[in-house]
């Protein structure tokens, strides 16, 4: 780094907030897509490319004039298996987190033309090639449809679908959000002759309703209506049936055949949560009950006399937790061996860490493959030879992922294929791997800038550097940035793990003011080793402000004991910890206990809420960002996972004291920033209009802003940069910085 | 390889029911459809009827009273059988697998000859 | 019942000759149309599916065009293994019906 340990003496100049909104230093990525085992496509200057993995050599798949006088902008592409069609989406209109419509058409690549006939219909809402061949699915008005050939016409495969109530083939707004975020509710089986499907019912769901205030020429604003089930009310209910694509024609209905749930879950309310093919003619679906601390995995076969699905009792598989809830967010899925009569799955083991076991579809019992006090973050590919999976091991630093492999005829032999490619610069992998596993792109996001790779699994040898934000750094040099710690406290015997964004030219005998970046949610990490360029960066760059996080109870990657400490109990110790982890902060010397600050948005919203209101005496001010406020206002797949049903019976005592606005009082000895908007479907408003009515009601002074017809995210470009800039004001304000 | 094989043709007085046989290798009578079509001595084809996949039946509403198609999907056999047969039931009588909306496999065809 | 009619009922060609078959539906059947070719003593086999793509192993000199009501088969140029009856088959609604057949004849 240019420049010297002297601040006063640093001519370069900092990263600004304007930096920031306009994204002036921008992260390179190197986004490819595997088409088969030696080949990938990459988009350069609008020419989609294919490349040799072994060799490196490109050739023009697509040119960037093919589409000239298509007259739509295109939004997405997606090639078919074999080749010789791609897909375009245009006109999309987004809906929430994960879904969309769209408008598509089809290419033939062999005769270089649109196909003109039997086209996709105009706001379709998924579609999807069959994994291999050109079959397509798709979902229209909450119906599926399959397409045999692209200029075929399709054949219709449910009738029952209808707006907010039935879905077909994709998902409500709860199983998208909170099961199998996307919206896609298809899987088709690996050659592509069978189509499973879940079909959602929403018809005694309540609907959550909000303004919308739209352009200002409109007189009355729209009320958007969604079927939400909050905590404790009425839940979707799900049925799961697989179609022969063969057996389609015009002339007759198409025979959907059910797999009903296990008479385990049909005893009450439960959720679809996984769906996994294991050969052409076995499937695995997983099912949880409502309280989710149980789960049934059944695995399903394909019956040619019959035509019909058989789920042997003797192959249930059941995962099931006593401390808190089944899987990370849900349960894991399981990798099959090629044969189908075997799977690889990431789950608990008897110390609460989660890593791999090895199943046998008729056995009950699993062998652990993997095992320490670290755990397995996701199994990446699997082979005759080996299994590849990226976990927190390396260094004993759970904030830390690498890739591995396991050699599955000897479980001891395990080689880290990733921790000493560049052990300074990367310690933050993820993976892409060809299509049978013959290659890899790594994908290092950190502490140092991104850095992609190719890799051949022949020999674990590199073979190119895709990617190394050269440009980046060379512009980065010149600018004076923060630098990063990543460290533990021990609190109880127990390592916590922290980062702090520390000011250029940090000096450990100065006092600086320090702000608190929470999120604690259940299985939340934010002390990591990934680099960023965000508001942090700014505030350290150029307010000389210290950002931290700190991963307390409740956080994940770290075993099953910190991470269901929170069980039934949100709003206590996550809350409690980051207290504490502010008060440790201060006690270091380079903390300024007079101007500490915190904020969050969502559950971070939550938690700075509930800090701020808790009378510590510890912050001087916060923000939060479309805060959850009472737990009975969200959703009931997220909250009832953690905090099981708002009944007497059950729970209903901790939702009640668990509540912002119960800590109304307390806000008059903190300066607070509530930020909401309008048209959050996720996080309702309604959450923030709560909090500050009970502010009002007990006289409490604070700020507080709404934007009109924002979603969660806040993320159009003018409320991007307006509610970074508001932030700033207040925290610049509340620090007294000029 | 995909094969369908007939069997069961042949000489039949009036009145008589006729059975005919058509045994597919190469698929599942669970996925594909089966139809039967005629063509009398010189004429063009006509259609009889189908039995889906999911053994649901169709037929031509001429035939309906007096015609039944059925399966054995152990024995990968389809069945014809029609009742009251008269003289303008004779004809070459074929099986043919559904593929989505057209036939791309085709019995040899049986003889089926109605004369007292 | 959706009623085919097809024309001519036979035509009379030379090998090398590029000959053409209509085939007319009663009503609108979109683009579900289908063509077969049956020579003396043989089952019909498939040529033509879905109005105009040609089904597997069938000679690119076939090929068939149309949608709605009216449909063309065409042969570009006549092979003597051509010399066939040919029947137009509508896939739309129940009961499915047939032409009553082209046949081709050598001249």
């Known amino acids: 780094n240019k420049g010297t340990d002297d601040a006063t003496a640093d001519s370069r100049k900092t990263y600004t907030l304007t930096d920031y909104l306009k994204n002036t230093y921008r992260l390179k990525l190197y986004s490819l897509r595997w088409i088969s085992d030696h080949e990938y496509l990459y988009k350069q200057e609008n020419n989609i490319l294919v490349f040799n993995a072994e060799y490196g050599n490109s050739s023009v798949f697509l040119e960037n004039s093919t589409f000239d006088e298509f007259g739509h902008s295109i939004n997405d592409y997606s090639i078919s298996p074999d080749g010789q069609f791609i897909l375009l989406e245009y006109n999309y209109v987004k809906q929430w987190r994960h879904s969309y419509t769209a408008s598509y058409d089809i290419y033939d690549l062999n005769k270089r033309q649109l196909i003109t006939e039997e086209r996709i219909p105009n706001n379709t809402q998924w579609v999807t090639w069959s994994p291999v061949g050109h079959k397509l699915a798709y979902v229209w008005n909450n119906d599926i449809y399959v397409k045999i050939e692209p200029n075929l016409p399709s054949y219709r495969i449910t009738w029952t679908g209808k707006e907010d109530i039935i879905y077909n083939g994709i998902t409500d707004w709860v199983y998208e959000e909170e099961v199998f975020s996307a919206y896609s509710a298809l899987w088709w089986s690996p050659n592509g002759t069978f189509l499973a499907y879940a079909q959602f019912n929403d018809t005694e769901v309540p609907l959550i309703e909000y303004s919308f205030y739209s352009d200002e020429s409109l007189q009355y604003p729209k009320t958007v209506r969604v079927p939400y089930p909050k905590a404790g009310a009425v839940n979707p209910t799900v049925k799961f049936f697989v179609v022969n694509t063969d057996s389609l024609s015009s002339v007759t209905n198409a025979t959907s055949i059910q797999i009903t749930a296990p008479a385990s879950m049909l005893i009450g309310d439960h959720y679809l949560c996984d769906v996994t093919w294991a050969t052409q003619e076995r499937i695995s679906l997983q099912w949880l009950r409502r309280i989710q601390n149980y789960s049934v995995m059944d695995i399903c076969d394909y019956d040619e006399s019959s035509g019909r699905w058989n789920c042997l009792v003797a192959r249930q598989h059941i995962e099931m937790s006593t401390t808190g809830w089944v899987g990370r967010f849900r349960p894991s899925e399981p990798h099959f061996t090629l044969d189908g009569n075997s799977f690889y799955k990431i789950i608990s083991n008897e110390e609460g860490y989660r890593h791999i076991c090895y199943f046998q579809i008729d056995k009950k019992d699993c062998t652990f493959i993997t095992k320490g006090t670290w755990e397995v973050i996701g199994i990446e590919a699997l082979t005759s030879d080996y299994l590849y999976y990226i976990s927190n091991e390396y260094k004993g630093m759970p904030g830390g992922r690498n890739l591995y492999k396991i050699q599955l005829s000897d479980y001891t032999k395990v080689t880290c294929l990733s921790c000493e490619l560049n052990p300074e610069r990367c310690q933050y992998y993820s993976v892409s791997f060809s299509k049978e596993a013959k290659y890899y792109q790594l994908r290092c996001s950190g502490p140092g800038l991104p850095l992609y790779t190719l890799h051949s699994s022949v020999n674990d040898k590199g073979l190119r550097v895709l990617e190394d934000n050269s440009a980046l750094d060379k512009m980065l040099q010149n600018v004076q940035m923060p630098s990063k710690k990543l460290d533990f406290i021990i609190l109880n015997e127990t390592k916590f793990w922290y980062q702090m964004i520390l000011p250029p030219h940090f000096d450990k005998s100065k006092k600086y003011p320090l702000l608190l970046d929470v999120y604690a949610g259940p299985c939340s990490q934010k002390a990591d080793t990934v680099f960023r360029l965000n508001w942090a960066t700014y505030l350290a760059s150029t307010e000389n402000i210290i950002v931290a996080s700190f991963d307390g109870r409740g956080s994940g990657y770290q075993g099953d004991k910190i991470m269901h400490a929170i069980n039934r109990r949100l709003g206590t110790f996550e809350v409690e910890d980051q207290i504490e982890a502010a008060r440790q902060f201060s006690k270091m010397g380079f903390v300024d206990n007079k101007r500490i600050a915190i904020w969050g948005w969502s559950y971070g919203g939550y938690v700075t809420s509930m800090v701020l209101g808790s009378g510590s005496g510890v912050f001087k001010c916060g923000i939060a960002v479309a805060p959850v406020s009472r737990w009975e206002y969200y959703d009931s797949v997220y909250t009832e996972r953690y905090m099981g049903l708002p009944t007497p019976e059950d729970n209903l005592d901790h939702y009640r004291n668990s509540t912002v606005m119960s800590r109304a009082e307390n806000f008059k000895q903190v300066e607070y920033l509530l930020i909401h908007g309008t048209a959050d479907d996720n996080v309702h408003f309604q959450q923030s209009a709560q909090i500050s009515k009970a502010l009002v009601d007990v006289g409490v002074d604070f700020q507080a802003m709404w934007y009109t017809d924002e979603d969660h995210g806040i993320a159009s470009s003018t409320a991007h940069q307006h509610i970074y800039t508001h932030m700033s004001h207040f925290i610049k304000q509340c620090f007294s910085l000029p | 390889e995909v094969q369908l094989v007939q069997s069961g043709g042949g000489v039949k007085q009036p009145g008589e029911t006729l059975r005919l046989t058509c045994t597919a290798s190469g698929f599942s009578l669970t996925t594909y459809g089966v139809h039967w079509v005629r063509q009398a001595p010189g004429k063009g084809l006509e259609w009889v009827g189908v039995i889906w996949g999911d053994g649901r039946t169709d037929y031509d509403a001429a035939f309906m009273s007096r015609v039944t198609i059925s399966k054995d999907t152990s024995k990968s056999t389809a069945y014809l059988q029609m009742n009251s047969l008269r003289a303008e039931d004779t004809a070459v009588y074929y099986c043919m697998r559904n593929r989505h909306d057209w036939f791309d496999y085709w019995g040899q065809g049986t003889t089926v000859t109605v004369s007292s | 019942d959706i009623l085919m009619t097809q024309s001519p009922s036979s035509l009379s060609a030379s090998p090398g000759d590029r000959v053409t078959i209509s085939c007319r539906a009663s009503q609108d059947i979109r683009n579900n149309l289908n063509w077969y070719q049956q020579k003396p003593g043989q089952a019909p086999r498939l040529l033509i599916y879905?109005?105009?793509n040609l089904h597997s192993g069938v000679p690119d000199r076939f090929s068939g065009s149309g949608s709605g009501t009216d449909f063309t088969l065409t042969i570009s140029r006549l092979e003597p293994e051509d010399f066939a009856a040919y029947y137009c088959q509508q896939s739309i609604k129940l009961p499915l019906t047939f032409g009553s057949g082209t046949k081709v004849e050598i001249k």
């Open positions: 879905y109005s105009s």
